[in-house]
């Protein structure tokens, strides 16, 4: 598992300290208090395609 | 089968201290979360504090902090609690319990207890 | 801290009556709500997370309700080994989750 400071998490998710693993950035939003949100801020979403030009 | 057995409770004065076990066996200890939950005999359950699986990062109820230590040996499949300057309102079953593998969701599993009574 | 409030704190009922159980948060928790059974002497027992998730092994006449500050648990016909003590918990709040006071169920 990474540990904090190696490589960092996919596109999208960030570091759990109370998890020990990478965390999705999506809960962030229904529950902000995560400890690994604050990385969030810093770690856009994945993109995603347009559906119009 | 999942099994958590706590241990090392017990009667003791005011001020004094104690250390709890947690033996868990039936799955593999390292990856989970754990906690430790208690409650006042007919009382309700109150958390008391949560370890990360490495036990890197761990929190504490402002009720127990600077007085309580959470830590853990995964070489031994083991929890541990460690209670400093016990208070009489410190009296109570103390349960370990698994975290579920997302953060802080549930717990899924529970030990029996160990009843620690704060008494002169 | 966010405070949980269950009513009623307590409710008799017969073998084979639905059981309503509520639990009403202090502030919005999103559906990060679970519910325990414990019975006397007996560690906790998870019935359901999330709001309405069915824990593995927990029969289906247990079911559960709700979001933001309004959440239900049901048991649609109560078994003799249901009669026991209920509580929700949050895990919203993190890390200070908090429990309901419970709702014990006995015997009418």
């Known amino acids: 598992e990474q540990a904090p400071g190696t490589a960092p998490c996919s596109r999208g998710s960030s570091w759990s300290a109370d998890l020990d693993k990478c965390a999705d950035c999506a809960s962030c939003r229904a529950r902000p208090h995560s400890d690994f949100c604050l990385g969030c801020a810093a770690a856009p979403p994945a993109p995603f395609r347009l559906l119009w030009p | 089968e999942v099994q958590l057995l706590e241990s090392g409770g017990g009667l003791v004065q005011p001020g004094g201290s104690l250390r709890l076990s947690c033996a868990a066996s039936?799955?593999?200890?390292?990856?989970?979360?754990m906690m430790w939950v208690r409650q006042a005999p007919g009382k309700g359950l109150e958390w008391v504090s949560y370890?990360?699986?490495?036990?890197?990062?761990?929190h504490y109820a402002d009720s127990v902090k600077g007085r309580f230590t959470i830590s853990r040996d995964n070489s031994k499949n083991t929890l541990y609690l460690q209670m400093n300057s016990l208070r009489a309102e410190d009296t109570a079953v103390y349960y370990c319990?698994?975290?579920?593998?997302?953060?802080?969701?549930?717990?899924?599993?529970w030990g029996q207890g160990t009843l620690v009574t704060v008494s002169s | 801290d966010i405070q949980m409030t269950q009513s009623p704190s307590s409710l008799s009922a017969s073998v084979g009556d639905r059981v309503t159980i509520t639990c009403r948060a202090s502030?919005?928790?999103?559906?990060?709500l679970n519910w325990y059974q414990q019975k006397p002497g007996k560690a906790p027992k998870l019935l359901i997370y999330?709001?309405?998730s069915l824990q593995s092994g927990v029969p289906s006449r247990f079911s559960g309700s709700g979001s933001g500050t309004d959440f239900t648990l049901t048991i649609s016909s109560l078994q003799p080994e249901d009669f026991a003590t209920y509580y929700c918990?949050?895990?919203?709040?993190?890390?200070?989750?908090?429990f309901g006071q419970g709702t014990k169920v006995e015997i009418k």
């Open positions: 319990a698994r975290g579920g593998d997302t953060y802080f969701d549930y717990f899924d599993y």
């Open positions: 039936g799955f593999t200890f390292s990856p989970y979360p």
């Open positions: 370890i990360s699986p490495s036990g890197g990062s761990t």
């Open positions: 502030q919005s928790i999103s559906s990060y």
């Open positions: 999330a709001a309405s």
């Open positions: 918990q949050q895990s919203y709040s993190t890390p200070g989750i908090t």
